[in-house]
C-alpha cells in the first residue's frame, strides 16, 4: 500500500530571464527513493538516479542545473517555460509517486510564489 505523499512548491511564478527552483519532497513513507525524474509536459528534463547520479537532458543543459537536493533549477526563463512540471519519484517497494508544479513566467516584476499543496 502506498502511504507516502509528495509535497511540492505548488503554483509558482517567476520573471522572464530569471531562475526558479523546482522542489518536491516525499514524506510519510519509509520507501527507498531509487530515482527521481523531472519532466516538462512529456519532455524529460533530468534524472537523478541513486546509484548513477544526475543525468541532465542534452536538450536542456544550457538552462537546467541539478539541485538543490533532488530539486531542479531552471535558468534564463522564457515565457515558453510556462506550464506544468512533474517530479516522478521511483521508490521501492511502494512504486511511483508523482508531484505537479505549475510555473508561470511573467514579463513584469510582480512574480510571487504560490502556496504549497500536496498530491497523495
Amino acid at each position: 500500500m502506498m502511504t507516502g505523499t509528495i509535497e511540492t512548491t505548488g503554483n509558482i511564478s517567476a520573471e522572464k530571464g530569471g531562475s526558479i527552483i523546482l522542489q518536491c519532497h516525499l514524506s510519510s513513507t519509509t520507501a527507498q527513493v531509487t530515482q527521481v525524474n523531472w519532466e516538462q509536459q512529456d519532455q524529460l528534463l533530468a534524472i537523478c538516479n541513486a546509484d548513477l547520479g544526475w543525468h541532465i537532458s542534452p536538450s536542456f543543459k544550457d538552462r537546467v542545473a541539478p539541485g538543490p537536493g533532488l530539486g531542479l533549477t531552471l535558468q534564463s526563463l522564457t515565457v515558453n517555460d510556462t506550464g506544468e512540471y512533474f517530479c516522478i519519484y521511483h521508490t521501492y517497494p511502494d512504486g511511483t509517486y508523482t508531484g505537479r508544479i505549475f510555473l508561470e513566467v511573467l514579463e513584469s516584476s510582480v512574480a510571487e510564489h504560490g502556496a504549497r499543496f500536496q498530491i497523495p
Epitope: N37, L44, G53, P58, S59, A65, P66
Partner: antibody
Framework: QVQLQQSGDELVRPGTSVKVSCQAA????????ILWIKQRPRHGLEWIGD????????NYNEKFKGKATLTADTSSSTAYMQLNSLTSEDSAIYYC???????????WGQGTSVTVSS | DIVMSQSPSSLPVSVGEKVTMSCKSS????????????LAWYQQIPGQSPKLLIY???TGESGVPDRFTGSGSGTDFTLTISSVKAEDLAVYYC?????????FGSGTKLEIK
C-alpha cells in the same frame, strides 16, 4: 559483466525494412540509455538516436526521423531499431551502445552490418 | 549542431613514440553546473567496435592503460599517448555528448611510420 549482443548481419532489398536487436546483460537495463550509431566508410560515426528503457523517452537525430524507430522491451532487456524504406545509403554497420549522463558510451555492441542490395 | 574537428587525419608513428592528437568543437562543451567537459575519446581497432578511453575530457575509463591521457577544456581538447604500442594502431574519435545531436570527429588514424 556488461554485454550488448546485437542480432546478425542483414542483406535486404531496397524499399524494405529491417529490425536490428540489441540484448543487454550484466546491468540494470532500465538505468541506462541505449544509443544507436551508424558507421559508413568515409562518413565516420553518426548518432541516430537514443531510448531510455526506464521511461521510454526517445530522442532522434533530425536526419534519421522517419527513417529509424527505436523501441525497448524491458522484460527481455532488449532494444530495437527499425529502419524503413531502405536504400543503398542505409548500407552501414549499426552499433548499439549504452550511456548515462556524465559517463559517455562505455559499452558497445559488436555491430550489425546491413547491406541494401537488389 | 556542434561540429567536431580532428587533426591530423593521419598520424604516422614509431613504437615507443609520444603522440598527441587534437579535437576542436564549434561551441563550448563545459557544463557550468559541474564544471565538466562533455567530451569523450574512443579507440576503434580495425574490424572492432569503438571502445571508450576517456570521458569528461580527462577522466580515464576503468581498465584503460594510463599511457592514454586526455586534456583540454571548452572547445580545445587533446588526446596523448605517452608511449605508443603496436596494439594502439587504430582510429581515434572524439565525441561531444553535451547537446543533441551527439556528434563525432572524423577521426585520427594512427599508422606505423
Amino acid at each position: 559483466q556488461v554485454q550488448l549482443q546485437q542480432s546478425g548481419d542483414e542483406l535486404v532489398r531496397p524499399g524494405t525494412s529491417v529490425k536490428v536487436s540489441c540484448q543487454a546483460a550484466g546491468y540494470t537495463f532500465t538505468n541506462y540509455w541505449i544509443l544507436w550509431i551508424k558507421q559508413r566508410p568515409r562518413h565516420g560515426l553518426e548518432w541516430i538516436g537514443d531510448i531510455y528503457p526506464g521511461g521510454h523517452y526517445t530522442n532522434y537525430n533530425e536526419k534519421f526521423k522517419g527513417k529509424a524507430t527505436l523501441t525497448a522491451d524491458t522484460s527481455s532487456s532488449t532494444a530495437y531499431m527499425q529502419l524503413n524504406s531502405l536504400t543503398s545509403e542505409d548500407s552501414a554497420i549499426y552499433y548499439c551502445t549504452r550511456y548515462y549522463g556524465p559517463y559517455a558510451m562505455d559499452y558497445w555492441g559488436q555491430g550489425t552490418s546491413v547491406t541494401v542490395s537488389s | 549542431d556542434i561540429v567536431m574537428s580532428q587533426s591530423p587525419s593521419s598520424l604516422p608513428v614509431s613504437v615507443g613514440e609520444k603522440v598527441t592528437m587534437s579535437c576542436k568543437s564549434s561551441q563550448s562543451l563545459l557544463y557550468n553546473s559541474n564544471q565538466k567537459n562533455y567530451l569523450a575519446w574512443y579507440q576503434q581497432i580495425p574490424g572492432q567496435s569503438p571502445k571508450l578511453l576517456i570521458y569528461w575530457a580527462s577522466t580515464g575509463e576503468s581498465g584503460v592503460p594510463d599511457r592514454f591521457t586526455g586534456s583540454g577544456s571548452g572547445t580545445d581538447f587533446t588526446l596523448t599517448i605517452s608511449s605508443v604500442k603496436a596494439e594502439d594502431l587504430a582510429v581515434y574519435y572524439c565525441q561531444q555528448y553535451y547537446s543533441y545531436p551527439f556528434t563525432f570527429g572524423s577521426g585520427t588514424k594512427l599508422e606505423i611510420k
